[in-house]
Interface confidence: low
């Protein structure tokens, strides 16, 4: 089955700058600004565009050692990024993949809204564990806040 979870979160960072840092340079930023959450990001294949495979490794103590993400779409004009978790982590007997869509929308106050859709593709009639959805949401939120803090402290970066 397919289980869809949608969420919105806001940021004080302008959309274009946030897309540049959080989406386009997340591979470099995440281990730097949130080493407690992501220990490394390794490019397995591709140049960052659709089809690119990345291996995201987690610190010791996490329930999962790594996940592999596949980039599905990068829209620099509309600040959209689609990717799928295809291996490692929760992917296995009951879960086939997780398709994620992130869209960053500018707000009148100069900040932005992140619209996030997570589609869990389960095998057979298996359901999604609430704990997994929560964990994924918390991971995203913490990475976002870490990047946000970095950008606020480094006003010259990613402009």
């Amino acid at each position: 089955g397919v289980f869809n979870y949608e969420t919105e979160t806001t940021s004080v960072i302008p959309a274009a700058r946030l897309f540049k840092a959080f989406i386009l340079d997340g591979d470099n930023l995440f281990p730097k600004v949130a080493p407690q959450a992501i220990s490394s990001v390794e490019n397995i294949e591709g140049n960052g565009g659709p089809g690119t495979i990345k291996k995201i490794s987690f610190p010791e103590g996490f329930p999962f050692k790594y996940v592999k993400d596949r980039v599905d779409e990068v829209d620099h004009t509309n600040f959209k990024y689609n990717y799928s978790v295809i291996e490692g982590g929760p992917i296995g007997d009951t879960l086939e993949k997780i398709s994620n869509e992130i869209k960053i929308v500018a707000t009148p106050d100069g900040g932005s809204i992140l619209k996030i859709s997570n589609k869990y593709h389960t095998k057979g009639d298996h359901e999604v564990k609430a704990e997994q959805v929560k964990a994924s949401k918390e991971m995203g939120e913490t990475l976002l806040r870490a990047v946000e803090s970095y950008l606020l402290a480094h006003s010259d970066a990613y402009n």
């Epitope: 949130a34 407690q36 959450a37 610190p59 103590g61 996490f62 329930p63 704990e131 929560k134 964990a135 949401k137 918390e138 939120e141 913490t142 806040r145 870490a146 803090s149």
Partner: antibody, heavy 127, light 111 residues
Framework: EVQLVESGGGLVQPGGSLRLSCTAS????????THWVRQAPGKGLEWVSH????????TYADTVKGRFFTSRDNVKNTLFLQMDSLRAEDTAVYFC????????????????????WGQGTTVTVSS | DIVMTQSPLSLPVTPGEPASISCRSS???????????LDWYLQKPGRSPQLLIY???HRASGVPDRFSGDGSGTDFTLKISRVEAEDVGVYYC????????FGGGTKVEIK
């Protein structure tokens, strides 16, 4: 440098109140659960309370429930412990400590221990 | 509530020799995700506590590899492969599976 600094301790009469503060620096304060732990003179460590990174979830030890209140100001990177109806047995050194990385709830998948501690502040409850 | 019991209360040690401290919980600390929610802390004389081991066996950042955590469920052990003079202090285990609670502590001192 990652650090926590407690303040606000002092001498207070039984039944009185005191508010402790713990100021964080060197890390993204709002991403971490924070704890209060105390140590009575010559005794062991006693966990007092914790609060989630976003301040929405708090838990207290039975010994302080209903009398102590933990809160945080993520803009000022400060943790608070409001202590009311103080008793002689609350006399202790109070430490704040950084807990798990997380944002909204007590999520067990991301637990790294209490890895940063403050120097402690002394609370004496006596008439 | 989960009760944590440590032994021994006091442990005289010889530098260079191994040492071990036991910690027992009144309920299993093994979570369904496979991790044991038990930490070990050391409080050196006149100092704040410091984290040694989390999740039963994971050494915290900067902790020497002579320290190791072992055990699962209700029985846990902190081992020091070769005690050094700087290791003196009170060692505490702590469970975080439910509302956190510490063991009573084990005082390690040089013979």
């Amino acid at each position: 440098e990652v650090q926590l600094v407690e303040s606000g301790g002092g001498l207070v009469q039984p039944g009185g109140s005191l508010r402790l503060s713990c100021t964080a620096s060197g890390f993204t304060f709002s991403s971490y659960m924070t704890h209060w732990v105390r140590q009575a003179p010559g005794k062991g460590l006693e966990w007092v309370s914790h609060i989630s990174g976003d301040g929405t979830n708090t838990t207290y030890a039975d010994t302080v429930k209903g009398r102590f209140f933990t809160s945080r100001d993520n803009v000022k990177n400060t943790l608070f412990l409001q202590m009311d109806s103080l008793r002689a047995e609350d006399t202790a050194v109070y430490f704040c400590a950084r807990g798990s990385w997380y944002t909204t709830g007590w999520h067990r998948n991301y637990y790294f221990g209490m890895d940063v501690w403050g120097q402690g502040t002394t609370v004496t409850v006596s008439s | 509530d989960i009760v944590m019991t440590q032994s021994p209360l006091s442990l005289p040690v010889t530098p260079g020799e191994p040492a071990s401290i036991s910690c027992r919980s009144s309920q299993s600390l093994l979570h369904s995700n496979g991790y044991n929610y038990l930490d070990w802390y050391l409080q050196k004389p006149g100092r704040s506590p410091q984290l040694l081991i989390y999740l039963g066996s994971h050494r915290a950042s900067g902790v020497p590899d002579r320290f190791s955590g072992d055990g699962s469920g209700t029985d846990f052990t902190l081992k020091i492969s070769r005690v050094e003079a700087e290791d003196v202090g009170v060692y505490y285990c702590m469970q975080v599976l439910q509302t956190p609670s510490f063991g009573g502590g084990t005082k390690v001192e040089i013979k």
